[in-house]
């Protein structure tokens, strides 16, 4: 049986204060720019170094932002979402959905096409090589006795 990759979804309220360089992140998504198929939600695409978000540390690239200051981000055009963030004021409250990758099933048997799974030959080849080296060393040792 192949293992599968599931996601543990958690939500968090993150309160940020705009720094000298702003909140410090970029977004993707919107009804006119779907980032995830069948999902027009707004996602964090990049967190800028030394920005408020980076210094706070909780917001991560790939997080989905559900609301800004209590205002839902569903069914917004991309530019409207950008404008909403830019006009959100000094203190900004973000409702964020984190997706943490969790693996079910036997280790080393992730679902096909999952790039984070380790192919079995990548484990077997080094093990085989080590076995051969050990056997060769053992034979050399025995010959010297």
């Amino acid at each position: 049986m192949n293992g599968r990759v599931d996601y543990l979804v958690t939500e968090e309220e993150i309160n940020l204060t705009r720094g000298p360089s702003g909140l410090g992140f970029n977004i993707v998504g919107g009804t006119d720019q779907q980032y995830v198929s069948n999902d027009s939600g707004i996602y964090v695409s990049r967190i800028k170094e030394n920005g408020a978000a980076a210094l706070d540390g909780r917001l991560q690239e790939g997080d989905k932002i559900l609301s800004v200051n209590g205002q839902d981000l569903k069914n917004l055009l991309h530019q409207d979402a950008v404008d909403l963030f830019r006009n959100a004021g000094y203190a900004v409250s973000l409702r964020v959905q984190h997706r943490l990758q969790v693996q079910n099933g036997p280790i080393g048997h992730r679902g096909e096409g999952d790039p984070s799974g380790i192919p079995i030959f990548m484990v077997l080849v080094p093990v085989f090589a080590l076995t051969m080296v050990a056997a060769w060393a053992f034979m050399r040792y025995r010959q010297q006795l």
């Epitope: 360089s21 702003g22 970029n26 800028k48 963030f85 830019r86």
Partner: nanobody, 120 residues
């Protein structure tokens, strides 16, 4: 990173016209909003106007409205500030600045070195 180079600044008589250019180093310049700013001697840098990534949103401050316009040519990776009916008080170093269009902030991340405009 995006490098910006302004050009076109010179000495001009009051009532004259100038076109400033802001050329970018990146091939994805069409993904950036661009703002023009100016700094007169002994004064703070002030916002003049901006244009969004696609060119369909443009704004200029009241003091230059009707005299200055901003437009862009994305294939040429260039944004222009067209200045007409120039006044002595328009004398300043003019800067262009860029920010990624999907940034959640108003602040501009990339700045040029500026070009001097002197109106006599």
């Amino acid at each position: 990173d995006v490098q910006l180079v302004e050009s076109g600044g010179e000495l001009v008589q009051a009532g004259g016209s100038l076109r400033l250019s802001c050329e970018a180093s990146t091939g994805t310049f069409g993904d950036y909003d661009v703002g023009w700013f100016r700094q007169a001697p002994g004064k703070d840098r002030e916002f003049v106007g901006s244009i969004n990534w696609s060119g369909d949103r443009r704004t200029v401050v009241n003091s230059v409205m009707g005299r200055f316009t901003i437009f862009r040519d994305n294939p040429k990776k260039t944004v222009y500030l067209q200045m007409t009916s120039l006044k002595v008080e328009d004398t300043a170093v003019y800067y262009c600045a860029a920010r990624f269009r999907s940034s959640v902030d108003w602040q501009y991340d990339y700045w040029g070195q500026g070009t001097q405009v002197t109106v006599s």
